[in-house]
C-alpha cells in the first residue's frame, strides 16, 4: 500500500510544548487534491506549528486549506493571550472548567464528563449531542487532567485539544509523549452499530471491524455512537482507507525519555467528525 511507503521515521530534536489544536482539521496533512490547477493556498503545519504555503490542485483536498495566511492563522493558531498552554508549573485552570455542565438543546444521551467547581471534581453527565459548552470531556481522565488540581494544587496540563466530535467545542486530547506515538485510528470504528433511542428509520452505514467492511443499518435518529455514516464512501474513508492517516513528511519533536534522541514513528488519526 502506498500509504505505508510514505511512512517516515522521524528524528526527534527540538522541544515543543504539547500541541493544542483549535480545530481537528488543522492536524490534517496538506492535500493538493487530484486536480491539476496551480493555486496558492495555506495550511497549518502541526510540526512547525505555523501556517505555510502549499500548491492546491483546485478540487477535493481537505479543510486544512485557506485562501490567506491570515485566515489560516485565525482558524488554527491561538494568540499568546488566549493560549491554554502554560509555561509555568503552577498553572491555572482554563476558564471553561468553571462553566456549569450544559447538556445542550439536543437529546442524544451521550455520556460525558464535566468539572464541577462546587465539588472540585470531574463528574459524569448526559450530553445531548449539540451545542452545550467547552466543559465537556469524552473521558474522565481528560477532564481530570485539564480541570482538576494535581498534587500540591498544581494544575496538570499535558493535554492538547482537539475538536469535540459532536459540538464544535474544544475537547482535551492527550498528547503525552508515550501516547502520541500510539494512536490507532478513530476508536468508534471498532464499536458495534447502535440504532439509538428514537423512532426514526434512517439509512446509515457502520464499519464492521470483524469483517473489515462497511455495512448498512437503520438509525433511530438520536443517540447511538460515532460509528454512523450517511454513505458507504464516507464510512470507508473514515474507517478503512484512513484508519490511520500516516504523516508523510518529516518533522522534529523532542521526547524527554532517557535524555537521548530517539527514532520514532508518528501516526495521527484523521478525524472526520468536522468536515469537519
Amino acid at each position: 500500500d502506498s500509504e505505508e511507503d510514505e511512512e517516515h521515521t522521524i528524528i526527534t530534536d527540538t522541544e515543543l510544548p504539547p500541541l493544542k489544536l483549535m480545530h481537528s482539521f488543522c492536524a490534517f496533512k496538506a492535500d493538493d487534491g487530484p486536480c491539476k490547477a496551480i493555486m496558492k493556498r495555506f495550511f497549518f503545519n502541526i510540526f512547525t506549528r505555523q501556517c505555510e504555503e502549499f500548491i492546491y490542485g483546485g478540487c477535493e483536498g481537505n479543510q486544512n486549506r485557506f485562501e490567506s495566511l491570515e485566515e489560516c492563522k485565525k482558524m488554527c493558531t491561538r494568540d499568546n493571550a488566549n493560549r491554554i498552554i502554560k509555561t509555568t508549573l503552577q498553572q491555572e485552570k482554563p476558564d471553561f472548567c468553571f462553566l456549569e455542565e450544559d447538556p445542550g438543546i439536543c437529546r442524544g444521551y451521550i455520556t460525558r464528563y464535566f468539572y464541577n467547581n462546587q465539588t472540585k471534581q470531574c463528574e459524569r453527565f448526559k450530553y445531548g449531542g449539540c451545542l452545550g459548552n467547552m466543559n465537556n470531556f469524552e473521558t474522565l481522565e481528560e477532564c481530570k487532567n485539564i480541570c482538576e488540581d494535581g498534587p500540591n494544587g498544581f494544575q496538570v496540563d499535558n493535554y492538547g485539544t482537539q475538536l469535540n466530535a459532536v459540538n464544535n467545542s474544544l475537547t482535551p486530547q492527550s498528547t503525552k509523549v508515550p501516547s502520541l506515538f500510539e494512536f490507532h485510528g478513530p476508536s468508534w470504528c471498532l464499536t458495534p452499530a447502535d440504532r439509538g433511542l428514537c423512532r426514526a428509520n434512517e439509512n446509515r452505514f457502520y464499519y464492521n471491524s470483524v469483517i473489515g467492511k462497511c455495512r448498512p443499518f437503520k438509525y433511530s435518529g438520536c443517540g447511538g455512537n460515532e460509528n454512523n455514516f450517511t454513505s458507504k464512501q464516507e464510512c470507508l474513508r473514515a474507517c478503512k482507507k484512513g484508519f490511520i492517516q500516516r504523516i508523510s513528511k518529516g518533522g522534529l519533536i523532542k521526547t524527554k525519555r532517557k535524555r537521548k534522541k530517539q527514532r520514532v514513528k508518528i501516526a495521527y488519526e484523521e478525524i472526520f467528525v468536522k468536515n469537519m
Epitope: 482539521f25 450544559d102 438543546i105 439536543c106 437529546r107 459540538n167 464544535n168 472526520f272 468536522k274 468536515n275
Partner: antibody, heavy 123, light 112 residues
Framework: QVQLQQSGPGLVKPSQTLSLTCAIS??????????WSWIRQSPGRGLEWLGI?????????RYAVSVKSRITINPDTSKNQFSLQLNSVTPEDTAVYYC?????????????WGQGTLVTVSS | DIVMTQSPLSLPVTPGEPASISCRSS???????????LNWYLQKPGQSPQLLIY???NRASGVPDRFSGSGSGTDFTLKISRVEAEDVGVYYC?????????FGQGTKVEIK
C-alpha cells in the same frame, strides 16, 4: 399536534420594554425533549435568533450576544408558556417576532413556529 | 459567529424543472453520527417558516421527496427535483454547530 400562540402588543415606545408571550399546546414547556426559542425577522437583518430556554435536570438559557444585556426569556410552567422581554428597545428592534419549538429528539430543528407578531418600535 | 451565505438570492423557476440553492458557512460545520448540523426552512408568503430538511439531509415529516439536502464542511445544497407552484417562498439554511444559531439571508424562489 403542537401549537404555539403568540400574544403581546404590536407597538412599543423607544427605551421601553418589549414583552411577548408564547402559549404552548400539545407539548410542555418543561419537556426534556424540546427547547423554546425566540427568533425575529426584519428586512434589514433577516431571521435572527435571539435566545432559547430548555429544561433538563434544571433550567438552562442561552442568548444571542447582540441582545444579551437586554433580553430575558422565562418559562411559566403553571400556564405552560414562555415569554420574551427585551429592554431598552430602539427602532432597530422593529421586526416580526416568532416563538419556536426546537425538537431535541428527532429533528434537531425548529419544527413548530408561532404565527409571528409584528412589533413596531416608535414614539 | 458563523455566517451563512446563500446563493442565489433570487431564483426564478419553471414548474417541472429542477432548482438548486447553495448555502455556504464561514466555518466547517460538525458532522457527527452521520448528521450535519444544518437545517433548511421554507417560508411561504404570509406564513411562518417551516422545517424542510433537518440534520443536513433528512426530510421533515410531510415534506415531498422532491426536496433533498446534501453537502458537508462549508458547502451545502438544497435541491428540488421538479419545482411545483406551491414551492414558492423564501428558503433559509440554519446552522446549530455553535452559538449563536444563525440563518442564511434567504433565497426567494418564484415562478417565471
Amino acid at each position: 399536534q403542537v401549537q404555539l400562540q403568540q400574544s403581546g402588543p404590536g407597538l412599543v415606545k423607544p427605551s421601553q420594554t418589549l414583552s411577548l408571550t408564547c402559549a404552548i399546546s400539545g407539548d410542555s414547556v418543561s419537556s426534556d425533549s424540546a427547547a423554546w426559542s425566540w427568533i425575529r425577522q426584519s428586512p434589514g437583518r433577516g431571521l435572527e435568533w435571539l435566545g432559547i430556554i430548555y429544561k433538563r435536570s434544571k433550567w438552562y438559557n442561552r442568548y444571542a450576544v447582540s441582545v444579551k444585556s437586554r433580553i430575558t426569556i422565562n418559562p411559566d410552567t403553571s400556564k405552560n408558556q414562555f415569554s420574551l422581554q427585551l429592554n431598552s428597545v430602539t427602532p432597530e428592534d422593529t421586526a416580526v417576532y416568532y416563538c419556536a419549538r426546537w425538537d431535541s429528539d428527532k429533528h434537531w430543528g425548529f419544527d413548530y413556529w408561532g404565527q409571528g407578531t409584528l412589533v413596531t418600535v416608535s414614539s | 459567529d458563523i455566517v451563512m451565505t446563500q446563493s442565489p438570492l433570487s431564483l426564478p423557476v419553471t414548474p417541472g424543472e429542477p432548482a438548486s440553492i447553495s448555502c455556504r458557512s464561514s466555518q466547517s460545520l460538525v458532522i457527527s453520527r452521520g448528521n450535519t448540523y444544518l437545517n433548511w426552512y421554507l417560508q411561504k408568503p404570509g406564513q411562518s417558516p417551516q422545517l424542510l430538511i433537518y440534520k443536513g439531509s433528512n426530510r421533515a415529516s410531510g415534506v415531498p421527496d422532491r426536496f433533498s439536502g446534501s453537502g458537508s464542511g462549508t458547502d451545502f445544497t438544497l435541491k428540488i427535483s421538479r419545482v411545483e407552484a406551491e414551492d414558492v417562498g423564501v428558503y433559509y439554511c440554519q446552522q446549530y454547530d455553535s452559538y449563536p444559531l444563525t440563518f442564511g439571508q434567504g433565497t426567494k424562489v418564484e415562478i417565471k
